[in-house]
Interface confidence: low
């Protein structure tokens, strides 16, 4: 929540439209990896500000007479991790008045992401040839989940799912045997998280 | 030429109230964070409140509710209303701007000195 | 009782190398920059070294920062007798700026 202080002036948002907010190469990266956060307005602008709400680390400015400021993180570390924003300005707006500020964006800077759950459903004990369904869940959108089978070198299946978490169905005559996921970010550099636990399925 | 002029320091009784401004020239007083510092007789400095750009102000625990910082950009100006005083509350108070990247304060104020006694 | 810990004193004599110390933990120091602040007796702060181990334009480059894990240091080499001063380390963590209680260096002889 981004609450101006005072004398700081945030116009209607049909005044000075909000400008976008962008991650390269991802908004998910190991340590160390060089990120370019991209703020690009609906209109040349003069300034363009990147700050991180609810925080008091000071802000970065770009003085540029276009569209677009890139904001280079280099070698980024988990502490620079968070919530980021980005503003613009004209000089012709007079002091203090900046644009809106763009949606958020979450970037995340981690060697391993938070392991995931792996549930069946209805449940783990399923009738002779019954299908069943498996859902591996992480805490993240946007993922490659893969789904693993114990004694089977290769991965199962794979999904690519824009929430947070992906189904795999498994064949009611196959389905018996033990199980764990994970998930990973879908393009280089590539973030894996920790294995799930192990989740056994037997007939009943 | 960037300077930092702090005035609004003198004599108050306990439990009085005292309002300091620090006024700014040489930049674009808006676009920065202003934060307010404080010292006591022989002691170390101590961070008192900040302004951001965007957002709510930050304060130390020790000053929350007692102490507002404010800013006025059209007057290049930063305040801090100061409530409550107690003797402890003697210091030199700076105004110091910080830096566009890496949590540092670039530029201080000379400081103007509160006194709390009866 | 300041969060980042500072020697309260450190001393040496003109030329000598002398190094200044300043703990803190994981929510600070750990994740975040620190910077170092020189106070000379009856002046204002002044800004020694920004981001660990940047120096501003105008600070001589005997003074150098250094960070590894929770703890920053601060050199002086070439000691001269005008480097007789507090200096304070700082840092912040999410919801406050955090400053070490100081050192008094002493220029001996």
């Known amino acids: 929540d981004i609450t101006p202080s005072v004398a700081i002036i945030v116009p209607p948002a049909s005044y000075h439209p909000k400008p976008w907010l962008g991650a390269q190469p991802a908004t998910v990266v190991t340590p160390g990896v060089n990120v370019t956060l991209r703020c690009r307005a609906p209109q040349p602008a003069w300034r363009f500000g990147l700050f991180k709400p609810g925080e008091i680390a000071p802000l970065l400015f770009r003085d540029v007479s276009s569209e677009l400021a890139e904001f280079f993180l280099e070698e980024v570390t988990p502490a620079q991790g968070g919530s980021y924003r980005c503003c613009y300005r004209r000089p012709d707006w007079g002091p203090g008045v900046w644009s809106q500020p763009s949606d958020v964006l979450e970037l995340l800077v981690t060697e391993e992401l938070p392991r995931p759950s792996l549930v069946a459903l209805p449940g783990p004990v399923v009738g002779p040839g019954a299908n069943v369904s498996l859902r591996c869940a992480g805490r993240l959108r946007n993922m490659s989940f893969v789904l693993y089978r114990e004694g089977v070198a290769a991965p199962l299946q794979y999904r690519h799912s824009a929430q947070p978490w992906a189904d795999f169905t498994l064949l009611g005559a196959r389905a018996p045997g033990t199980y764990s996921c994970y998930y990973h970010t879908p393009s280089a550099p590539y973030v894996l998280s920790q294995r799930s636990e192990v989740l056994v399925i037997s007939w009943e | 030429e960037v300077q930092l002029l702090e005035s609004g320091g003198g004599l108050v009784q306990p439990g009085g109230s005292l309002r300091l401004s620090c006024a700014a020239s040489?930049?674009?007083?808006?676009?920065?964070?202003w934060t307010w510092v404080r010292q006591a007789p022989g002691k170390g400095l101590e961070w008192v409140s900040g302004?951001?750009?965007?957002?709510?102000?930050n304060y130390a625990q020790n000053f929350q509710g007692r102490f507002t910082i404010s800013r006025d950009n059209s007057k290049n100006t930063l305040y801090l209303q100061m409530n409550s005083l107690r003797a402890e509350d003697t210091a030199v108070y700076y105004c110091?701007?910080?830096?566009?990247?890496?949590?540092?304060?670039?530029?201080w104020g000379q400081g103007t000195l509160v006194t709390v006694s009866s | 009782q300041s969060v980042l810990t500072q020697p309260p004193s450190a001393s040496g004599t003109p030329g000598q190398r002398v190094t200044i110390s300043c703990s803190g933990s994981?929510?600070?120091?750990?994740?975040?920059?620190v910077s170092w602040y020189q106070q000379l007796p009856g002046t204002a702060p002044k800004l020694l070294i920004y981001?660990?181990?940047n120096r501003p334009s105008g600070v001589p480059n005997r003074f150098s920062g250094s960070k590894s894990g929770t703890s920053a240091s601060l050199a002086i080499s070439g000691l001269r007798s005008e480097d007789e001063a507090d200096y304070y380390c700082q840092s912040y963590d999410s919801s406050s700026w955090l400053f070490g209680g100081g050192t008094k260096l002493t220029v001996l002889g």
């Open positions: 981001g660990n181990s």
């Open positions: 110091a701007k910080a830096g566009f990247t890496g949590g540092h304060f670039d530029i």
């Open positions: 040489g930049f674009t007083f808006s676009d920065y964070y």
């Open positions: 994981s929510s600070n120091i750990g994740n975040n920059y």
């Open positions: 302004s951001p750009v965007f957002g709510a102000a």
